[in-house]
Amino acid sequence: VSVETQAYFNGTAYLPCPFTKAQNISLSELVVFWQDQQKLVLYEHYLGTEKLDSVNAKYLGRTSFDRNNWTLRLHNVQIKDMGSYDCFIQKKPPTGSIILQQTLTELSVIANFSEPEIKLAQNVTGNSGINLTCTSKQGHPKPKKMYFLITNSTNEYGDNMQISQDNVTELFSISNSLSLSFPDGVWHMTVVCVLETESMKISSKPLNFTQEFPSPQTYWK
C-alpha cells in the first residue's frame, strides 16, 4: 500500500496505516510501528502499549497515535521531515517477525510564502529612475520565479532574481529588483510583483506611481 500526504511547516502530518486485513485481529495482538527512510523509529505500539525505548530521539515527544483510524500524527513538521515513511503491522512469534501489512507514505512539506512586498529603493523624482525591490519569505518548496508586471503590458520584468535558503529551517526566500522610468507621455504607472510556485501565483499589493512633472528623458531598463 502506498499513499501520499502533505503537511504544512510547523503543522501536523498524518501518516496512515490502514489495516485492511483487520477482520478479527485487535491492536493488542499486534506490533505496529513507523520508521523513516533511514530506518529510524518514530513510534511503536507493542501489543496494545506504547513502546518508547525503540523511538529515535529526534521523534520523541513529536508523535501521537490515533488508534481509531490507525494513523500516526507527526507534530511540528519541519522541512527535513520530508521523505518516505513506512508503517509496519507485524506479528512477532518465536520464529521471527511476520509483516501482515506495510504502508509507504510519501510526505511533502509546504510552507506558504509571505505575500510579495514591493519596496521603493528611493524617492520618485521627475528625472531619476525608479528602483524597486520585491521580496517574499519563508516558503517551500523552492519557487519557480518572481517578476514585475507593469500597467498595460504583459511582459514580465525583473533584473536580478535571487533565491536563498535558510540553513536551519530550510525555507526559501526570494527577491527581485527592477529599475524603470516613465515612458514618454505616461504620467501614471501601476506595478505588481508576482511570485510563481509549482502550485500557485501570489501577487503583491499594487504600487501606484504618478509622475511629478514631465521628463524629457524616457527609457526602460
Epitope: D86, K92, P93, T95, G96, S97, I98, I99, Q102
Partner: antibody, heavy 115, light 113 residues
Framework: EVQLVESAGGLVQPGRSLKLSCAAS????????MAWVRQAPTKGLEWVAT????????YYRDSVKGRFTISRDNAKTILYLQMDSLRSEDTATYFC????????WGQGVMVTVSS | DIVMTQTPSSQAVSAGEKVTMSCKSS????????????LAWYQQKPGQSPKLLIY???TRESGVPDRFIGSGSGTDFTLTISSVQAEDLADYYC?????????FGSGTKLEIK
C-alpha cells in the same frame, strides 16, 4: 505486484552441488524474512530453511543442516539456496516463499538428484 | 519437532456441499504473549504453487473467498469450506510457524464428485 521467480534447477549427480536463486520484486525485500520449501514428487510440502530480513539469522531443517546454506543479497533482491553434498532424497520441486507465513510463493523449480 | 496431523487424507464431495478438514498439532500453537495461534492453511491446485488461504488460524488472506473459514485454537484446528465449488479441487495443507522447524501436515486431497 509481488513476484518471486526461481532460477532453473536441473539434474545433478549425488554428492555434487547446485545453487538456486529466487529473484524478488514488487515489495521491500530487505524488510521480509524469506524461506525455501520443497515438495518431492507426489508428496507433501516440506520446509527447508528460513533467513531473517537482514540475513543475520538462518534456520534449517535437520536433514539439510551442514549441507544447505540459505543466503540473500538485499541490494540485488535475490534469495539463494546453496545445496552441497546432494542426495537422492533431495529430489523435489523447490519453492521460495515470502516470510514464514508464506504469503507469496515462486513458481517452483525442479531439482533431480540422480546418477 | 511439532507434528501436524491432518485428517482425512482425502475427501470427495459434491459442489455446494459443506466440507470440513482437521489439523491437530502435537503441542499448542497459542502464543501466550499475543494470544495468537500460529497456524496457516494453504491450497495447492494441481500443477500450481501453494497459495495462502488462512493465517493466525482464522484470518482470511486478502482475496480469498469468504466460503473458506479457519477456526480452532491450541492444538485443534479446522478448515471449513461452506459451499464447495468445482475450482476448490486441490490439496489443502496446514502449517505451524510457532517454532522451528516449521512443519506442514501431510495434506487433505479434496475431490469433487
Amino acid at each position: 505486484e509481488v513476484q518471486l521467480v526461481e532460477s532453473a534447477g536441473g539434474l545433478v549427480q549425488p554428492g555434487r552441488s547446485l545453487k538456486l536463486s529466487c529473484a524478488a520484486s514488487g515489495f521491500t525485500f530487505s524488510d521480509y524474512y524469506m524461506a525455501w520449501v520443497r515438495q518431492a514428487p507426489t508428496k507433501g510440502l516440506e520446509w527447508v530453511a528460513t533467513i531473517s530480513h537482514d540475513g543475520s539469522s538462518t534456520y534449517y531443517r535437520d536433514s539439510v543442516k551442514g549441507r544447505f546454506t540459505i543466503s540473500r543479497d538485499n541490494a540485488k533482491t535475490i534469495l539463494y539456496l546453496q545445496m552441497d553434498s546432494l542426495r537422492s532424497e533431495d529430489t523435489a520441486t523447490y519453492f521460495c516463499a515470502r516470510q514464514n507465513i508464506m504469503d507469496y510463493w515462486g513458481q517452483g523449480v525442479m531439482v533431480t538428484v540422480s546418477s | 519437532d511439532i507434528v501436524m496431523t491432518q485428517t482425512p487424507s482425502s475427501q470427495a464431495v459434491s459442489a455446494g456441499e459443506k466440507v470440513t478438514m482437521s489439523c491437530k498439532s502435537s503441542q499448542s500453537l497459542l502464543y501466550s504473549r499475543d494470544q495468537s495461534n500460529y497456524l496457516a492453511w494453504y491450497q495447492q491446485k494441481p500443477g500450481q504453487s501453494p497459495k495462502l488461504l488462512i493465517y493466525l488460524a482464522s484470518t482470511r488472506e486478502s482475496g480469498v473467498p469468504d466460503r473458506f473459514i479457519g477456526s480452532g485454537s491450541g492444538t485443534d484446528f479446522t478448515l471449513t469450506i461452506s459451499s464447495v465449488q468445482a475450482e476448490d479441487l486441490a490439496d489443502y495443507y496446514c502449517q505451524q510457524h510457532y517454532n522451528y522447524p516449521l512443519t506442514f501436515g501431510s495434506g487433505t486431497k479434496l475431490e469433487i464428485k
